[in-house]
């Protein structure tokens, strides 16, 4: 249905990392434009990205209002230059997105090792608490603020001279691990939300090694 020169959007896909959330779709428009609407299951539709020739729409501002809600979006197709035109049923063509629950589905961004400090045979490794676009009281919340103890970090650490990766876990942003005196170690961290069934892990942080700038060594 619809006018002869418009086609419905398809392959509607949510792309979301640390709550930065974009809806993408196909096809690239030929003589047509798109408008996106988003709603919670029980809420009203809100229009975004009016009459755009893009095939993506940033919906971050809407989903961060309540990241635990489930959202649905739809993409309307209109003839270019004649956006009042409707399909044969009296409505413009549109396609629904899959449902999306940011808290459960947003990908965890690549973490960063902020610092590490060696004191004797102990090393303290600190993970940067990344800021998200989720706001409370006009303040941007960190990943830890949003997820609390649902978020853990896995630390992989290994002797520079070895390949086997030992692991440690924390539900804060700090690790305190035992190391062998006189050995240099390398570190990488991964964010994990164990309670999830999908998108449980982030990609690994860049590897940081002792003897490089980030760390500090103190002999006791």
């Amino acid at each position: 249905s619809g006018t002869t020169n418009t086609v419905a959007a398809y392959n509607l896909t949510w792309k979301s990392t640390n709550f930065k959330t974009i809806l993408e779709w196909e096809p690239k428009p030929v003589n047509q434009v798109y408008t996106v609407q988003i709603s919670t299951k029980s809420g009203d539709w809100k229009s975004k990205c009016f009459y755009t020739t893009d095939t993506e729409c940033d919906l971050t501002d809407e989903i961060v209002k309540d990241v635990k809600q489930t959202y649905l979006a739809r993409v309307f197709s209109y003839p270019a230059g004649n956006v009042e035109s409707t399909g044969s049923a009296g409505e413009p063509l549109y396609e629904n997105s899959p449902e999306f629950t940011p808290y459960l589905e947003t990908n965890l961004g690549q973490p960063t090792i902020q610092s590490f400090e060696q004191v004797g045979t102990k090393v303290n490794v600190t993970v940067e608490d990344e800021r998200t676009l989720v706001r409370r009281n006009n303040t941007f919340l960190s990943l830890r603020d949003v997820f609390g103890k649902d978020l853990i970090y896995t630390l992989y650490y290994w002797k520079s001279s070895s390949s086997g990766k030992k692991t440690a876990k924390t539900n804060t942003n700090e690790f305190l691990i035992d190391v062998d005196k006189g050995e240099n170690y390398c570190f990488s961290v991964q964010a994990v939300i164990p309670s999830r069934t999908v998108n449980r892990k982030s990609t690994d942080s860049p590897v940081e090694c002792m003897g490089q700038e980030k760390g500090e060594f103190r002999e006791i």
Epitope: Y156, G164, K165, A168, T170, V192, P194, K201
Partner: antibody, heavy 120, light 107 residues
Framework: EVQLVESGGGLVQPGGSLRLSCAAS????????IHWVRQAPGKGLEWVGY????????YYADSVKGRFTISADTSKNTAYLQMNSLRAEDTAVYYC?????????????WGQGTLVTVSS | DIQMTQSPSSLSASVGDRVTITCRAS??????VAWYQQKPGKAPKLLIY???FLYSGVPSRFSGSRSGTDFTLTISSLQPEDFATYYC?????????FGQGTKVEIK
């Protein structure tokens, strides 16, 4: 339903090689960690090693280091244990197991095991 | 590596008995201890995680506790299906290590 199914066990001569497979269903292995644990006849459980299939990181028990290699094929949702230079003391039932990955829960699901016998 | 010393290695008990199995870690492992049950020819099954939390579907007669580096598995009233071997395991550091096992037999 979460399931782990090991295969590839059998009789092998000392010094020989064998590759065990662990086919997972009901979950995506790259979202978890996979361990191999073995049990010699009439003995207790011995941890062999782990892999994080999302990045290929591994760690091995000293008793198998340099002889055993764990790998994973995420497209097949399967983990492997390549065993080289096998010894009589490697005779055991080999289990693959899923690591839930939280601070609290460690291994929550196990396969049924596959028997490896090293004998001449 | 951390050693987990489990005792006793075996015990005989009757249905309805209270059974206690202990595991001692060679160093601090916080609460990162699990208990598994294994029956002959079968894979182990998770009973207790994080020292004292009952895993989903496990009967409430099983319980776990911690005192420093000592960990205890208790079966409050032994049932016929509980005759099996029990293992503790620490996962505080790599490599994770198991206790030697405790075989619970019928008296």
């Amino acid at each position: 339903e979460v399931q782990l199914v090991e295969s590839g066990g059998g009789l092998v001569q000392p010094g020989g090689s064998l590759r065990l497979s662990c086919a997972a269903s009901g979950f995506t292995i790259s979202d978890y960690w996979i361990h191999w644990v073995r049990q010699a006849p009439g003995k207790g459980l011995e941890w062999v090693g782990y892999i994080d299939p999302s990045n290929g990181y591994t760690y091995y028990a000293d008793s198998v280091k340099g002889r055993f290699t764990i790998s994973a094929d995420t497209s097949k949702n399967t983990a492997y244990l390549q065993m080289n230079s096998l010894r009589a003391e490697d005779t055991a039932v080999y289990y693959c197991a899923r690591d839930y990955g939280s601070l609290q829960v460690f291994i929550d699901y196990w396969g049924q095991g596959t028997l490896v016998t090293v004998s001449s | 590596d951390i050693q987990m010393t489990q005792s006793p290695s075996s015990l005989s008990a009757s249905v309805g008995d209270r059974v206690t199995i202990t595991c001692r870690a060679s160093q601090d492992v916080n609460t990162a201890v699990a208990w598994y049950q294994q029956k002959p020819g079968k894979a182990p099954k998770l009973l207790i995680y994080s020292a004292s939390f009952l895993y989903s579907g496990v009967p409430s007669r099983f319980s776990g506790s911690r005192s420093g580096t000592d960990f205890t598995l208790t079966i409050s009233s032994l049932q016929p299906e509980d005759f099996a071997t029990y293992y503790c395991q620490q996962h505080y550091t790599t490599p994770p290590t198991f206790g030697q096992g405790t075989k619970v037999e019928i008296k």
